[in-house]
């Protein structure tokens, strides 16, 4: 089931999903001066079954001025420099789908893609937070957020992360011991069913991953 909101915003922090659950949508957004082709997809969809998942649909952008040319080629390195999408731009590739059944890896870029990726997540998705360059983590508990279903409504748990403006970047994920958490939503649910899936496997996966560089700006 779709989460009807975006993950929480943490000042001076970005978030990243290590893998995307089936049902996740990635909007086909084009950069300024370009638009989706007339018969183009609105979004890519993580689809499949428990043994194999992949992104359905392809995003295609065409110039707003000349609408007869369609582009779908992978950007050249110089084009990628201007992008600040959710892609990990470290040498490390996202976790292979095969290692996390029912999930998709980060989709490849498409030409003239917008500078920021917009995902729509589903219940059970976990995203991980990291302070942006020039900030470091303080008073930190779990630096992640999970979309949960409670009382028939979806909500994201509050990541317990504060980023302070000291010129020192933190490792990610979890290089510090959790300290006193900032005030946030209580995570205990006593009166109704909480639907949470795939948390353990994603947490374990994240814990084994090397430090990754995030470029998403959450707005």
């Amino acid at each position: 089931e779709l989460c009807d909101d975006d993950p929480p915003e943490i000042p001076h922090a970005t978030f990243k999903a290590m893998a995307y659950k089936e049902g996740t949508m990635l909007n086909c957004e084009c950069k300024r001066g370009f638009r989706r082709i007339k018969s183009g997809s609105l979004y890519m969809l993580c689809t499949g079954n428990s043994s194999h998942s992949s992104w359905d649909n392809q995003c295609q952008c065409t110039s707003s001025a000349t609408r007869n040319t369609t582009k779908q080629v992978t950007p050249q390195p110089e084009e990628q420099k201007e992008r600040k999408t959710t892609e990990m731009q470290s040498p490390m590739q996202p976790v292979d789908q095969a290692s996390l059944p029912g999930h998709c890896r980060e989709p490849p870029p498409w030409e003239n893609e917008a500078t920021e990726r917009i995902y729509h997540f589903v219940v059970g998705q976990m995203v991980y937070y990291q302070c942006v360059q020039g900030y470091r983590a303080l008073h930190r508990g779990p630096a992640e957020s999970v979309c949960k279903m409670t009382h028939g409504k979806t909500r994201w748990t509050q990541p317990q992360l504060i980023c302070t403006g000291e010129m020192e970047t933190s490792q990610f994920p979890g290089e510090e011991k959790p300290q006193a958490s900032p005030e946030g939503r209580p995570e205990s649910e006593t009166s109704c069913l909480v639907t949470t899936t795939d948390f353990q496997i994603q947490t374990e996966m994240a814990a084994t991953m090397e430090t990754s560089i995030f470029t998403t700006e959450y707005q």
Epitope: L2, M25, N27, R32, K38, D56, N57
Partner: antibody
Framework: EVQLVESGGGLVKPGGSLKLSCAAS????????MSWVRQTPEKRLEWVAY????????YYPDTVKGRFTISRDNAKNTLYLQMSSLKSEDTAVYYC??????????WGQGTLVTVSA | DIVMTQSQKFMSTSVGDRVSVTCKAS??????VAWYQQKPGQSPKTLIY???YRYSGVPDRFTGSGSRTDFTLTISNVQSEDLAEYFC?????????FGGGTKLEIK
């Protein structure tokens, strides 16, 4: 909570003009694509117009192209639909809708436009 | 334009029953189909996206299926609050088009 409140509907003569507004709240309006959809008296649903978050790209079906113009003021969190050369077949309840993956994920309560002599 | 046909304008069912609303596209639309529920006096509410995925807050008794040209919305264990009109919609290509609607009546 997402709220979309349409206004500006009313009775107009054939050939006349009308401008609808949709006040949005509860979400980052300036980063969301928006649409207008109408529902005829026979309850048929018809997509009318679509605008990208920045307002630079717009889309219309042929039935309204050249007569209707969708626009937005992101500073005011407001979506507009300027309708001209109105016909009796434009009589409908007009809904604004926000995109959330789907083009029409969340709908307002609608405003009635009646085109009649 | 792609025509979305909901051949049954009315369907009658009882509380606890299972009912299937069908929709046929005039050409291949992949799985780019949504289903909406409109209760009397209200605006439409999204139930299903991409033919088979439940939207936010939608009870799991609503299930979507199908691809290409044939699509089905199934309501299992029908409740009295499911009294509504159900519309399919394709967003595979412009202009985006809706089915004519199927009104569900509860006996």
């Amino acid at each position: 909570e997402v709220q979309l409140v349409e206004s500006g509907g009313g009775l107009v003569k054939p050939g006349g003009s009308l401008k609808l507004s949709c006040a949005a709240s509860g979400f980052a309006f300036s980063s969301i694509d928006m649409s207008w959809v109408r529902q005829t008296p026979e309850k048929r649903l018809e997509w009318v117009a679509y605008i990208s978050s920045g307002g630079d790209n717009t889309y219309y079906p042929d039935t309204v192209k050249g007569r209707f113009t969708i626009s937005r003021d992101n500073a005011k969190n407001t979506l507009y639909l300027q309708m001209s050369s109105l016909k009796s077949e434009d009589t409908a309840v007009y809904y604004c809708a926000r995109r959330y993956g789907l083009p029409f994920a969340y709908w307002g309560q609608g405003t009635l436009v009646t085109v009649s002599a | 334009d792609i025509v979305m046909t909901q051949s049954q304008k009315f369907m009658s069912t009882s509380v606890g029953d299972r009912v299937s609303v069908t929709c046929k596209a005039s050409q291949n639309v992949g799985t780019n189909v949504a289903w909406y529920q409109q209760k009397p006096g209200q605006s439409p509410k999204t139930l299903i996206y991409s033919a088979s995925y439940r939207y936010s807050g939608v009870p799991d008794r609503f299930t979507g299926s199908g691809s290409r040209t044939d699509f089905t919305l199934t309501i299992s264990n029908v409740q009295s609050e499911d009294l509504a009109e159900y519309f399919c919609q394709q967003y595979n290509s412009y202009p985006w088009t809706f089915g004519g609607g199927t009104k569900l009546e509860i006996k």
